[in-house]
Interface confidence: low
Amino acid sequence: SLLQSALDFLAGPGSLGGASGRDQSDFVGQTVELGELRLRVRRVLAEGGFAFVYEAQDVGSGREYALKRLLSNEEEKNRAIIQEVCFMKKLSGHPNIVQFCSAASIGKEESDTGQAEFLLLTELCKGQLVEFLKKMESRGPLSCDTVLKIFYQTCRAVQHMHRQKPPIIHRDLKVENLLLSNQGTIKLCDFGSATTISHYPDYSWSAQRRALVEEEITRNTTPMYRTPEIIDLYSNFPIGEKQDIWALGCILYLLCFRQHPFEDGAKLRIVNGKYSIPPHDTQYTVFHSLIRAMLQVNPEERLSIAEVVHQLQEIAAARNVNPKSPITELLEQNGGYGSATLSRGPPPPVGPAGSGYSGGLALAEYDQPYGGFLDILRGGTERLFTNLKDTSSKVIQSVANYAKGDLDISYITSRIAVMSFPAEGVESALKNNIEDVRLFLDSKHPGHYAVYNLSPRTYRPSRFHNRVSECGWAARRAPHLHTLYNICRNMHAWLRQDHKNVCVVHCMDGRAASAVAVCSFLCFCRLFSTAEAAVYMFSMKRCPPGIWPSHKRYIEYMCDMVAEEPITPHSKPILVRAVVMTPVPLFSKQRSGCRPFCEVYVGDERVASTSQEYDKMRDFKIEDGKAVIPLGVTVQGDVLIVIYHARSTLGGRLQAKMASMKMFQIQFHTGFVPRNATTVKFAKYDLDACDIQEKYPDLFQVNLEVEVEPRDRPSREAPPWENSSMRGLNPKILFSSRE
């Protein structure tokens, strides 16, 4: 089933031993096989609506884990569970997020409970933060430095979520979802309410639409932590990541003053932001303005998570505290440091879902249907998962982001790593420190790594033993095809040279550009035959890369060039007669049409522009049905067509001036335009750099009217694919021999 293959992909196959038909308490004492692990289920840690969390021990290594067992009897719940697993896997590896280990499922057909069963394995934490805080209460208030460390580490976890593309919103941040690791650091858990969906209510929203959104959000949030924009949807404030900032403000207040700012969850007080900082507090004054900045009624006035983290860093610097360090003062209160197991007393009392210790997995009440399904489960999935099932399950094992400490480095396969820019100086406090990166790579892959810098910025290649390839391209552009092909060929040659060799790819943030290169390389090595599958793997191993349609198009070109029946790009020039947009896009201030002009680039050179004086450019109205820009330009190679809307503005001295607004852009390679083509069609989802959806009518498409010249016009230099053999390309090269 689709569901099973999704979980197979996420974790490698897992069989649920012989546990399937037992009730939850019978599960204790059983042995469960999960991937490579054989787990003895030791005891119940917590339970909720239809989920139990157990302490489990790997029979082989003796290592302890938290094992969450979920039962589901409907498809919607299944999808919600998969979404939670996907979020966990995507976010896992960050030092302040509970480490995902594995997941597996069996369908209701094989289970004698008559329900689908899911197992989710994570690291076992020492306990819930609230338990440790309760034990410390007798000693008086927390020190300012303890609050700083707890809160900073919590914010770092949320920052990791908000940095994803699209951002992941937790929606249920509360102290109960903070765990303390064995090392004494904060770990955020429970992604059962998380979403990537933001809402932008406005006056046009009907009461019914508001009610639906409100109902879905209410199901996924905790009353005390609900935000003004959620409680009063008619305020028309955006509902997005700033929900989490409000909740963090509540957490900071609670850590400081030992009570919640909205203890009673009174809607009126929340909507009006009516809370008060204890007037005589002098201990936590350093946090007062931060609390106020996070508990702003208007979400747009709240700080972003980046700003919160940076302000906390400044407080930490002023107080000479390392905010990332373990909160040992909490552990010292609780029977020594770093023991892996909880006290052996009776299990904690069972409360409602989400209460009690969950060992890395908070329990979500899944009994109600869930909203916000995972993007990849919408359309096109069968093909995607079929592709993935065809690959060895060992290929897709989980390798954590943040391979060492705080380094932002992710292994896409055991021989391909992606990281953010290795920075020097003060900048390295926010990004990968180049020295730390080198130390890490030198210790993990001594003499066997090559670095591929896809960013426009450079550093001394000697930092990485002169094994640095500078192969960047312009931001917000697809790479030139020959550049992309050369990167793939070079990486392949390096991996082939020695089985210990690895490729380390980076752009600025290790996202879009890195994803294009790495996904192209996965396809080049024939691990995948579609861009979609490659991009999905990248998303799971690192983060959703936020790439544009043209980026995907160029990855597809790579798939075509190495296919069993390869498509080699032809060398025929193309005459672009005109750009035709149907229906007319709505970019004028009155939303009645547009006044378009066009720029054409070949490679990095602008070869044509239809821009003229404002009045000489035609104004197209909706009733025209289509907007046509005559071009008559011959192109060959990598082409970028940018379409602008011309706007009249009054300049200084009341002179008419023209402002331009980008409507969209298209990037493609002429070598893949079929030889007999007269029209090249681009749907709305094929266009880059689009504006808000309302400006493009339904079924909007762009057609290039073209004519392919019959004769080849070879370029001065033969393209790299011409003298390149596609034989011997094998996905095995992407993995170390032991895999």
């Epitope: 900082i277 007037p279 507090d281 002098t282 004054t285 350093v286 007062h288 303005s289 931060l290 106020r292 900045a293 700080l303 972003s304 980046a306 700003e307 940076h310 302000q311 860093q313 400044e314 407080i315 610097a317 002023a318 100086g425 003060v426 406090a429 926010l430």
Partner: antibody, heavy 117, light 107 residues
């Protein structure tokens, strides 16, 4: 010893632009926030703008919002204030100061900006 | 915006006098108040932060008190070098407004 040295002031016409710089030394520049404060001739102090250690957080007085931009280059230990659409009322001595989260603990000697036709 | 009102706007006193300057905020600012001293042609100097904390290197004759909306700066025994203009400043998020200043002159 902490030192802050402003430069870039001078005479400019209304509507014109000017860029002030503040070179910092004697402390870890990238470790904390920085601010600009101004003082019109014979008048009191007016806070203008602040920036967090990384440059992510920027804050402006209403009187300059949309016209002034604060920025910093931590590799050069330098703070900047880009002032556009200058008005006569922007005439002042501009001080850069280290922003110790809630207070301004070290100040430069100031640079005079005169906006006049 | 939060308005800061200092009083008096000017004050004459003699060496050895005890002097008090007050500052009132238009709304509660907890203890987010700082005091600065400025001499003619010079940059301001931080004296007191967080209403009552003495900045290092500042003589102990300077002290600050208050919270909420009413604050005072006290110089217990005026010295010749203390004749200057004094400013209060609120640092309650997010705009850091100053009082109009109090000029302390030799009687």
């Amino acid at each position: 010893e902490v030192q802050l040295l402003e430069s870039g002031g001078g005479l400019v016409q209304p509507g014109g632009s000017l860029r002030l710089s503040c070179a910092a030394s004697g402390f870890t520049f990238g470790g904390g926030g920085m601010s600009w404060v101004r003082q019109a001739p014979g008048k009191g102090l007016e806070w203008v703008s602040s920036i967090s250690s990384s440059g992510y957080g920027t804050y402006y007085a209403d009187s300059v919002k949309g016209r002034f931009t604060i920025s910093r280059d931590n590799s050069k230990n330098t703070l900047y204030l880009q002032m556009n659409s200058l008005r006569a009322e922007d005439t002042a001595v501009y001080y850069c100061a280290r922003w110790g989260w809630s207070y301004l603990d070290y100040w430069g000697q100031g640079t005079l900006v005169t906006v006049s036709s | 915006d939060i308005q800061m009102t200092q009083s008096p706007s000017s004050l004459s006193a003699s060496v050895g006098d005890r002097v008090t300057i007050t500052c009132r905020a238009s709304q509660s600012i907890s203890s987010y108040l700082n005091w600065y001293q400025q001499k003619p042609g010079k940059a301001p100097k931080l004296l007191i932060y967080a209403a009552s904390s003495l900045q290092s290197g500042v003589p102990s004759r300077f002290s600050g008190s208050g919270s909420g909306t009413d604050f005072t700066l006290t110089i217990s025994s005026l010295q010749p070098e203390d004749f200057a203009t004094y400013y209060c400043q609120q640092s309650y998020y997010p705009l850091y407004t100053f009082g109009q200043g109090t000029k302390l002159e030799i009687k």
